[in-house]
């Protein structure tokens, strides 16, 4: 299973649920579904209030039970470490895969943290982060922001990933904007 890590804004916008949580239990495999289940302790929710409704406490995260079919394997044994988890809701359960955005909260830049807590949501409806995987690449629309991090370095380590968000500048136009300048 291979996939290019998304820009964090794309991960935020395409996910049903974005939370901060600690992985606290030994993973279990369900003998009917063959999905692996990690016990988590949610500390913050950034997206998904409406989707979840009253069941606003997520206690488990589910993933395929094998790496080759995109199952997520949690490598950290530190149960006090917080992770940003962006996943999909299926039948009210939080599902993630290898391709999901799961990262230690402490590894995120201050700008990314700001994005997840406040800013990325502003760009979800109108704007699209458009990956540029090889030169030349052209903007397909005024609402697209060309994401060129992959051309230069690891996509999640790039400047656009760590410091910028694709946000509306005016109707029908989105541009890269610094998240730093918005940190008050």
């Amino acid at each position: 299973c291979t996939c290019v890590p998304p820009h964090p804004q794309t991960a935020f916008c395409n996910s049903d649920l974005v939370i901060r949580a600690k992985f606290v239990g030994t993973p279990e495999v369900n003998q009917t579904t063959l999905y692996q289940r990690y016990e988590i302790k949610m500390t913050k929710m950034y997206k998904g209030f409406q989707a979840l409704g009253d069941a606003a406490d997520i206690r488990f995260v589910y993933t395929p039970a094998m790496e080759s079919v995109c199952g997520y394997f949690h490598r950290s044994h530190n149960r006090s470490e917080e992770f940003l988890i962006a996943g999909k809701l299926q039948d009210g359960l939080l599902h993630i895969t290898t391709c999901s955005f799961v990262a230690p909260w402490n590894s995120l830049s201050l700008a990314q943290r700001r994005g997840f807590t406040k800013t990325y949501t502003v760009g979800c409806e109108e704007c699209t982060v458009f990956p540029c995987l090889s030169i030349p690449c052209k903007l397909q629309s005024g609402t697209h922001c060309l994401w060129t991090d992959q051309l230069l370095q690891g996509s999640e380590k790039g400047f656009q990933s760590r410091h910028l968000a694709c946000l509306p500048r005016e109707p029908g136009l989105c541009t890269w904007q610094s998240l730093r300048s918005q940190i008050a």
Epitope: T26, P27, V29, Q31, T32, T33, A65, E67, V69, F73
Partner: antibody, heavy 113, light 110 residues
């Protein structure tokens, strides 16, 4: 009581195909993931494939991926293993198991020219 | 490609206790509480003796017990009996390969 009965084994030439069946009884079939495990003559056990209760998730060992297909028919309480492009090294007794707790008696598959 | 390491053979006299080890890695034995042990008599299907590291299915004698420390699981058979002579296999869930078995241990009752 739980019963698993395999069938469909036999002698097949290299490159040929075979379809194994496993008839299950004594439990709610759709509530359990099922597996195929094989054992070459005089050798140890090797996991081959697994399928979720609904049939929606399937997993394969690298040695059979792309050649074998696991499936199930919950209305017939039957598990299947479609084996294509068979090789000499696929020769083994094939066991059907209810997520490894109950096992059938096995069916012998011999791949030889 | 044997994923879990077991001794090829173990022997003991009737009434004695023996232990069979099963060594894996942090991605199989050490990472999950999903270690099972099977007994297989010649020409027969494997029979589950221990599941989830230390649980015994109903009908299995309490002479059989399982444990785990780090990346190594163990099966202990106390009060060895002639009918215990068989091959024993450990198995673990493995995230990369889903399920892995040990190479098997031949138990001889002297």
């Amino acid at each position: 009581q739980v019963q698993l009965v395999e069938s469909g084994g036999g002698l097949v030439q290299p490159g040929g195909s075979l379809r194994l069946s496993c008839a299950a009884s004594g439990f709610t079939f759709s509530s359990y993931a099922m597996s195929w495990v094989r054992q070459a003559p005089g050798k140890g056990l090797e996991w081959v494939s697994a399928i979720s209760g609904s049939g929606g998730s399937t997993y394969y060992a690298d040695s059979v991926k792309g050649r074998f297909t696991i499936s199930r028919d919950n209305s017939k309480n039957t598990l299947y293993l479609q084996m294509n492009s068979l090789r000499a090294e696929d020769t083994a007794v094939y066991y059907c198991a209810r997520f490894f707790d109950y096992w059938g008696q096995g069916t012998l598959v011999t791949v030889s020219s | 490609d044997i994923a879990l390491t077991q001794p090829a053979s173990v022997s003991g006299s009737p009434g004695q206790s023996i232990t069979i080890s099963c060594t894996g890695t942090s991605s199989d034995v050490g990472g999950y509480n999903y270690v099972s042990w099977y007994q297989q008599h010649p020409g027969k299907a494997p029979k589950l003796m221990i599941y989830d590291v230390s649980n015994r299915p109903s009908g299995v004698s309490n002479r059989f017990s399982g444990s785990k420390s780090g990346n190594t699981a163990s099966l202990t058979i106390s009060g060895l009996q002639a009918e215990d002579e068989a091959d024993y296999y450990c198995q673990s869930y493995d995230f990369r390969r889903f399920s892995v078995f040990g190479g098997g241990t031949k138990l001889t009752v002297l």
